[in-house]
Interface confidence: low
């Protein structure tokens, strides 16, 4: 039962994270939460950084600055892959949740 519950939580978290990405960066509250998660957990996007390509308000070769290894204003614009966290946040935060919750 624990595994089923954990899978359900992960699925919900994945859906919610992607939903929040859709509102980035127009909803300031959402943006700050996602930025905090990405910066704190050193991750980018839901599955990986390429998820940001699919977000209407984000353009080609752009990720939020919070995806950068060294966060500076504008670092996510025309980013270099070596300079950003490529791992997805759902898996990374999910792993942390599994260990700590």
């Amino acid at each position: 039962a624990g595994y089923v519950f954990r899978d359900k939580v992960m699925s919900e978290f994945n859906n919610n994270f992607r939903q929040q990405m859709e509102n980035y960066p127009k909803n300031n509250h959402t943006a700050s939460i996602l930025d905090r998660m990405q910066a704190d957990f050193k991750c980018c996007g839901a599955a990986n950084y390429t998820d940001w390509e699919k977000i209407p308000s984000m353009s080609k070769n752009r990720v939020p600055d919070s995806c950068c290894i060294n966060v500076t204003v504008g670092c996510g614009i025309n980013f270099n892959e070596k300079a950003i966290h490529k791992e997805g946040c759902v898996e990374k935060i999910g792993g942390w949740l599994r260990k700590n919750v």
Epitope: K26, E53, K54, P56, S59, K60
Partner: antibody, heavy 120, light 108 residues
């Protein structure tokens, strides 16, 4: 210099189809979102449709949803608007517009337009 | 959909005048508001984006302000080439992108 040149406008009967094209030059076409905006004679601007740089996101005005299809060919630096089941109220000058790099819904360059007249 | 309402619909002014056009959104759009100028027989031209950012090449007599639901476009000293129709546009909740109905600026 950025240039957008629309073509394909014509006089067509209601119910018929038409395909508009927009040839782009002077910028890296596949970095930018593109749009179609129309203006009926003597009226204001009405956004018709938009498409993201990689065709991953497309949007339509309710008035054309299900009848018009936007597409792009990045290799040919061209934007298209397939217009089916045309109505009299689709009569307008159709502009092709380029989105800003980091705010794709802001149109920083426009073509001169191509005229579509729907009449029997 | 978000409705954009401009006022006035038309106004007459003289060269050298300070002119203000307002745009109101039916709900908060943060600073996602853009202004365009259109002269008769010509394509629209972007003047201001993100409420107050002046587009490259646009004279500094044009300025924009506001956030939330109320926005203004100001021309500090009207020049002969400024007589045109001005449109506001929201880019907050899209699709659809929506424009105001336009404000026609005429010579007094």
């Amino acid at each position: 210099e950025v240039q957008l040149v629309e073509s394909g406008g014509a006089l067509v009967q209601p119910g018929r189809s038409l395909r508009l094209s927009c040839a782009a030059s002077g910028f890296t076409f596949d970095d930018y979102a593109m749009h179609w905006v129309r203006q009926a004679p003597g009226k204001g601007l009405e956004w018709v449709s938009g498409i993201s740089w990689n065709s991953g996101t497309m949007g339509y005005a309710d008035s054309v949803k299900g009848r018009f299809t936007i597409s792009r060919d990045n290799a040919k630096k061209s934007l298209y608007l397939q217009m089916n089941s045309l109505r009299a109220e689709d009569t307008a000058l159709y502009y092709c517009g380029k989105g800003l790099l980091h705010q794709w819904e802001v149109l920083d360059y426009w073509g001169q337009g191509t005229l579509v007249t729907v009449s029997s | 959909d978000i409705q954009m309402t401009q006022s006035p619909s038309s106004l007459s002014a003289s060269v050298g005048d300070r002119v203000t056009i307002t745009c109101r959104a039916s709900q908060s759009i943060s600073s996602y508001l853009n202004w365009y100028q259109q002269k008769p027989g010509k394509a629209p031209k972007l003047l201001i984006y993100a409420a107050s950012s002046l587009q490259s090449g646009v004279p500094s007599r044009f300025s924009g302000s506001g956030s939330g639901t109320d926005f203004t476009l100001t021309i500090s000293s009207l020049q002969p080439e400024d007589f045109a129709t001005y449109y506001c546009q929201q880019s907050y909740s899209t699709p659809p992108i929506t424009f105001g109905q336009g404000t026609r600026l005429e010579i007094k």
